[in-house]
């Protein structure tokens, strides 16, 4: 996470306490998981399988879509982010069972753990721009008909890519294997040395804009949204709507355990008896904040559920109707009937 | 008490190979990792590898690529260490040192009295 | 590799006083287990070295209580209350914490 932050399993009793019966043979590898790294890897291989399975189902679903359809560039892009950041879960997986013994190298050590951070970036500024999206669907229906078109969500979702890709960088940077003396390990994560200071502007630029800011604008956001939406019932995309907020409170609570953390690690002394609770619960957080890459396909099939009444379609279908349909503004007050039906046309050509 | 005795001192031609012994008395011989540290004349100390005789079990500094090879005989406590392909610059002091695994201490401890290898032509 | 950084690298004292040695390390010694590793060692002349301080600030034992040993992470002080002649020798600071062990490039004490 922030420090160098993976703890040894149970060496305890090989320090900091008297000697034991010297004829005792040591035993240099410890048997026994914690059990918040018992929970970590539970929830590190649901979301493997669910995310792997769903993510790619969304990919393969949404990409037909995504030449036409606005939302499903949108969805497309969420997928992508959570399906490769599933990808480096194997890898995760084993380093926890191995007591966080790193055997596959630096290059591997900068690049997979970053995968989550660029996930959560990638995540969250694409949410970002969908909720703008959705903003601007609701309150400026006139602009959306004339500008609103794939070629700009393209841009949109590049934009996001590359400054996810940005922010990623300082942990990418930073992130090294120590292998320690005894016990005997090589260790991945985040090392700042002699720079506290750094440390905890990552941290701090890592919960502004990765979580406090997005949380800030996007509940403004949808206070606006909903609140137009059930005053004047002024919107017929109100799937996409509750899907889009149910996407965006789950990214909340799921990175919540994860900045908390983060944040307190960076303030706190690596030897503090705090930190090294902290520590312990660090795959846990990690893994908690994983759940994210799995949870959208869920929210999908429930939403898809909810609006079919029950499971009649195959899921591929039921993943379409949620995942591929266009928003159209009806503002009767605003707009003549032909206004709406000729303004329907050209949204669904989109 | 603990004591790390080592074999005496050696003069040996570049290219050949040195093996250094240090015997162990006073301790549970197994419990223990045997470091191997040396000092050229006038540097500092550099620590060249390590052995757990419980299981053979070894770590090497990169440094020396492969020249080092450290070995231990559980029945006679007895640790040792081989230097290959020697070198001038590998005239030194050569230490055994002992870390021992279940003390409060883990630090390296106790350290033999040191045997001095020259190499010369 | 960790490199650790003595200084300074000589050190006259007057019997009596008091005698300071810093111990810089490149990297942080905070092992993932909370503990630092970081220990001191004397070399007296012609002998091998000897442990003082292990883990930043622990005597080992016979150590007389005037040798201290004090800081965190990458920054470490050896201190000698009052400085008597068998303290005469090189003093090495170590670390442990991470492979391969390093050592500091000693620092000389000499009696003035």
């Known amino acids: 996470m922030n420090s160098f932050n993976y703890t040894t399993p149970d060496y305890g009793h090989y320090d900091d306490k008297d000697t034991l019966d010297l004829n005792t043979p040591v035993d240099k590898t410890s048997n026994t998981l914690r059990v918040p790294d018992i929970l970590a890897l539970v929830i590190f291989a649901v979301v493997f399988l669910v995310g792997v399975l769903g993510n790619a189902l969304v990919v393969w679903v949404t990409a037909f879509e995504a030449k036409r359809t606005i939302n499903a560039i949108w969805f497309l892009n969420l997928a992508v982010a959570d399906f490769l950041s599933c990808l480096a879960l194997p890898i995760l997986f084993t380093s926890i069972v191995q007591h966080h013994h790193w055997p596959f190298g630096g290059a591997a050590c900068s690049i997979l753990p970053s995968l989550i951070l660029l996930n959560m970036y990638a995540s969250i500024l694409l949410l970002a721009t969908i909720s703008a999206d959705r903003f601007l669907l609701v309150f400026k229906p006139i602009w959306c008909q004339n500008f609103r078109g794939a070629g700009l969500a393209w841009i949109a979702c590049a934009v996001a890519w590359g400054l996810a890709l940005l922010l990623t960088i300082p942990s990418f940077l930073y992130r090294v294997v120590r292998e320690e003396y005894f016990p005997p390990k090589v260790l991945c994560g985040v090392d700042y040395s002699h720079d506290k200071r750094r440390e905890r502007a990552v941290a701090i630029v890592r919960l502004v804009l990765g979580f406090l800011w997005p949380l800030l604008t996007l509940t403004i956001c949808y206070t606006f949204i909903l609140l137009r939406t059930w005053s004047r019932r002024a919107t017929r995309s109100t799937k996409t709507l509750k899907v889009v907020v149910a996407v965006v409170a789950s990214f909340f609570i799921f990175w919540l355990p994860y900045q908390v953390t983060g944040i307190m690690m960076s303030f706190l002394e690596p030897s503090s008896p705090t930190f090294l609770l902290l520590n312990k619960l660090d795959s846990l957080c990690v893994s908690f904040a994983y759940i994210n890459c799995c949870i959208n396909p869920i929210i999908y099939v429930v939403a898809g559920q909810g609006f079919q009444g029950r499971l009649r379609k195959s899921l591929p279908s039921l993943l379409r109707n949620v995942l591929t349909e266009e928003s159209v503004v009806r503002e009767s007050k605003s707009f003549t009937r032909s206004t709406v039906d000729t303004m329907a046309q050209k949204t669904q050509a989109v | 008490q603990v004591q790390l005795v080592q074999s005496g001192a050696e003069v040996k031609k570049p290219g050949a190979s040195v093996k250094i012994s240090c015997k162990a008395s006073?301790?549970?011989?197994?419990?223990?990792?045997m470091n191997w540290v040396r000092q050229a004349p006038g540097k500092g100390l550099e620590w060249m590898g390590r052995i757990y005789p419980g299981d053979g079990d070894t770590k090497y500094n990169g440094k020396f690529k492969g020249r080092v090879t450290i070995t231990a005989d559980e029945s006679t406590s007895t640790a040792y260490m081989e230097l290959s392909s020697l070198r001038s610059e590998d005239s030194a002091v050569y230490f055994c040192?002992?870390?021992?695994?279940?003390?409060?201490?883990?630090?390296?401890?106790?350290w033999g009295q040191g045997t001095t290898v020259t190499v010369s032509s | 590799d960790v490199v650790m950084t003595q200084s300074p690298l000589s050190l006259p004292v007057t019997l009596g006083e008091p005698a300071s040695i810093s111990c810089r390390s490149s990297?942080?010694?905070?092992?993932?287990?909370?503990?630092?590793?970081l220990h001191w060692y004397l070399q007296k002349p012609g002998q091998s070295p000897q442990l003082l301080i292990y883990?930043?600030?622990n005597r080992f034992s016979g150590v007389p209580d005037r040798f201290s040993g004090s800081g965190s992470g990458t920054d470490f002080t050896l201190k000698i209350s009052r400085v008597e002649a068998e303290d005469v020798g090189v003093y090495f600071c170590?670390?442990?914490?991470?492979?391969?062990?390093?050592f500091g490039q000693g620092t000389k004490l000499e009696i003035k």
């Open positions: 170590s670390q442990s914490t991470l492979v391969p062990l390093t």
């Open positions: 006073g301790y549970a011989f197994s419990n223990s990792w």
């Open positions: 040192a002992r870390f021992l695994l279940i003390s409060t201490v883990t630090a390296v401890d106790y």
């Open positions: 990297q942080s010694l905070v092992h993932s287990n909370g503990n630092t590793y």
């Open positions: 883990k930043v600030s």
